[in-house]
């Protein structure tokens, strides 16, 4: 879904890899589905041009037409620009594809701000820097849109990697990843390493930057350090998880854990920020302000609107606290925590002050549709979407941005009782799956 800050606004130059790798635990290795070890052809297959989305190169049709496609774990349609648009350098030309099949059905996707609409069809699709397969997949050919494509973003479509339940126009439209798994021997798992820049990029650097990796069919051990910790996928629609506790610099926010998941908590590569329900956001900001009180910042900064700048290289990371989210573990009454640094939740913005300054936006924001663990979270971790085992794994990313004092962390186990009570049960109505805005 495509709202103001719904799409990532980060570019992705890989940060410094961590020098030390922690020893891996063998029990967890044996449980991993899919190919193990190296997926060298898929490493570095994502780009993240200056804050406007992580995209992968794909080909569509016969002969193949190459397009850059935004990787979005928060939606379930494969949709591509299929008509001229001022912001598109290229688009899918169905008439040039001998393998295109028209489904004679339209699709209309409105958002809180903007929309796209198009015509459904199928065609042959492959990922050049992915598995060596070609599949017939559903494609929404976008013929009209408003505030969807981003000027200069360098992507021409969106790859929704979530489940059929939230596909448009309805759950009968098989998502791309389902088609891929059905038509090939590729295991039902993919993993993402999004590498945030950590510092503002000028346009030249942004165009050339490596943004990360999408590993299809397994896990690449070179992309993380330490061990993977898994949280159950609560329900297969979005990648829904359950947060059981939130801490700012180790201080518990002490809220009813249902508040953290009201009305859901999802992992979404198509959202920039860590987005929190209103009450949680207010408590978190109050706590972050208190922790960083040696300096004061305007309200507009905490609203994610104003930029704050420091002399290049002097950003006072140490005054900002770490944020920890405790996620339900795989074992009863057991949780683990993921901890991000200000290097993740202060988002670098280029071209606003002078080259002598580093400028940032606060990338934690308020949500009316639950918690969204967007790029701000994902850039700290290697995230495994283990669909086969209905779980999501987190490990410290080998490319996360950090300093000499603190790194992102994935730690556990912690004893946490009554975690099932933390999930919010959305009242079922006929329209419950028609929510389109993730603002």
């Amino acid at each position: 879904t495509h709202l103001g800050i719904r799409l990532p606004l980060r570019s992705g130059l890989a940060g410094p890899p961590l020098g030390l790798r922690l020893p891996r635990e063998t029990d967890e290795e044996s449980e991993e589905p899919g190919r193990r070890g190296s997926f060298v052809e898929m490493v570095d297959n994502l780009r993240g041009k200056s804050g406007q989305g992580y995209y992968v190169e794909m080909t569509v049709g016969s002969p193949p037409q190459t397009l850059n496609i935004l990787v979005d774990t928060g939606s379930s349609n494969f949709a591509v620009g299929a008509a001229p648009h001022p912001f598109l350098h290229r688009y899918y030309q169905r008439q040039l594809s001998s393998t295109y099949r028209d489904l004679r059905k339209g699709v209309y996707v409105p958002y809180t701000q903007g929309k796209w609409e198009g015509e459904l069809g199928t065609d042959l699709v492959s990922i050049p820097h992915g598995p060596n397969v070609t599949v017939r997949a559903n494609i929404a050919a976008i013929t009209e849109s408003d505030k969807f494509f981003i000027n200069g973003s360098n992507w021409e479509g969106i790859l929704g990697l979530a489940y059929a339940e939230i596909a448009r126009p309805d759950d009968s439209l098989e998502p791309f990843f389902d088609s891929l798994v059905k038509q090939t021997h590729i295991p039902n798992i993919f993993s993402l390493q999004l590498c945030g820049a950590g510092f503002p990029l000028n346009q030249t650097e942004a165009l050339a930057s490596v943004g990360g990796s999408m590993i299809i069919g397994g896990i690449d051990h070179s992309l993380y350090t330490g061990r993977l910790w898994y949280t159950p996928i609560r329900r297969e629609w979005y990648y829904e998880v359950i947060i059981v506790r939130v801490e700012i610099n180790g201080q518990d926010l002490k809220m009813d854990c249902k508040e953290y998941n009201y009305d859901k908590s999802i992992v979404d590569s198509g959202t920039t920020n860590l987005r929190l329900p209103k009450k949680v956001f207010e408590a978190a900001v109050k706590s972050i302000k208190a922790a960083s009180s040696t300096e004061k910042f305007p309200d507009g900064f905490w609203l994610g609107e104003q930029l704050v700048c420091w002399q290049a290289g002097t950003t006072p990371w140490n005054i900002f606290p770490v944020i920890s989210l405790y996620l339900m573990g795989e074992v009863t009454n057991q949780s683990f925590r993921i901890t991000i640094l200000p290097q993740q939740y202060l988002r670098p913005v280029e071209d606003v002050a002078t080259s002598q300054d580093d400028c940032y936006k606060f990338a934690v924001s308020q949500s009316s549709t639950g918690t969204v663990m967007g790029a701000v979270i994902m850039e700290g971790f290697y995230v495994v979407f283990d669909r086969a085992r209905k779980r999501i794994g987190f490990a410290v990313s080998a490319c996360h941005v950090h300093d000499e004092f603190r790194t992102a962390a994935v730690e556990g186990p912690f004893v946490t009782a009554d975690m099932e009570d933390c999930g919010y049960n959305i009242p079922q109505t006929d329209e419950s799956t028609l929510m389109t805005g993730r603002a």
């Epitope: 300096e295 305007p298 104003q306």
Partner: antibody
Framework: QLQLQESGPGLVKPSETLSLTCTVS??????????WGWIRQPPGKGLEWIGN???????YYNPSLRGRVTISVDTSKNQFSLKLSSVTAADTAVYYC????????????WGRGTLVTVSS | EIVLTQSPATLSLSPGERATLSCRAS??????LAWFQQKPGQAPRLLIY???NRATGIPARFSGSGSGTDFTLTISSLEPEDFAVYYC??????????FGGGTKVEIK
């Protein structure tokens, strides 16, 4: 009612250090609601921001002046100060101290200003 | 760097007339913009903040509008004491650093 008053020498020799003090009266400089700043205006020209300080001592400086400028605060005297080193004739200006209010965003209260001339 | 361009440089009007001053930012500053008035030999005075909010004690004849890159200060009916130089300043990038070059409103 809060008032700001700049003080310091009106004439400074080239290559020397310009030193000014702003005295805050009518309220504490240690209020958590404000930053305090310096702005200057060369004769017949526009306004140029120099820098800000919070009562905790946290400072922000104009990149064009960095390396030459230091702003400090003395909460016991309810004052904040400006030092600008290695001055040249281009630093001749009216120097204003001001309060950054309205949520640390806008200079909502200004001193009357003091003219500093750099000349030998 | 965000550059603020004010126009016109000089505006020659008579008392009672309407004054329209423009401030254009080189990129969006949302609504984080202020207007100041400066009379000869005096310090600047905050007139408008957040693009359209009048500061304390500012008469209703002063109004601000705009967002993004284009902003306007309007003085509905010029009083003799309104002839002065007016500056805009953006605070989208914090701390506030950029002022426009100023518009002089003079008596025709």
């Amino acid at each position: 009612q809060l008032q700001l008053q700049e003080s310091g020498p009106g004439l400074v020799k080239p290559s020397e250090t310009l030193s000014l003090t702003c005295t805050v009266s009518g309220g504490p400089i240690s209020s958590s609601s404000y930053y305090w700043g310096w702005i200057r205006q060369p004769p017949g020209k526009g306004l140029e921001w120099i820098g800000n300080i919070y009562y905790s001592g946290s400072t922000y400086y104009n990149p064009s002046l960095r390396g030459r400028v230091t702003i400090s605060v003395d909460t016991s005297k309810n004052q904040f100060s400006l030092k600008l080193s290695s001055v040249t004739a281009a630093d001749t200006a009216v120097y204003y101290c001001a309060r950054l209010g309205h949520g640390y965003n806008y200079f909502d209260l200004w001193g009357r200003g003091t003219l500093v001339t750099v000349s030998s | 760097e965000i550059v603020l361009t004010q126009s016109p440089a000089t505006l020659s009007l008579s008392p009672g007339e309407r004054a329209t001053l423009s401030c254009r930012a080189s990129q969006s500053v949302s609504s984080y913009l202020a207007w100041f008035q400066q009379k000869p030999g005096q310090a600047p005075r905050l007139l408008i903040y957040d693009a359209s909010n009048r500061a304390t004690g500012i008469p209703a004849r002063f109004s601000g509008s705009g967002s993004g890159t284009d902003f306007t200060l309007t003085i509905s009916s010029l009083e003799p004491e309104d002839f002065a130089v007016y500056y805009c300043q953006q605070v989208y990038v914090w701390p506030p650093r950029t002022f426009g070059g100023g518009t002089k409103v003079e008596i025709k």
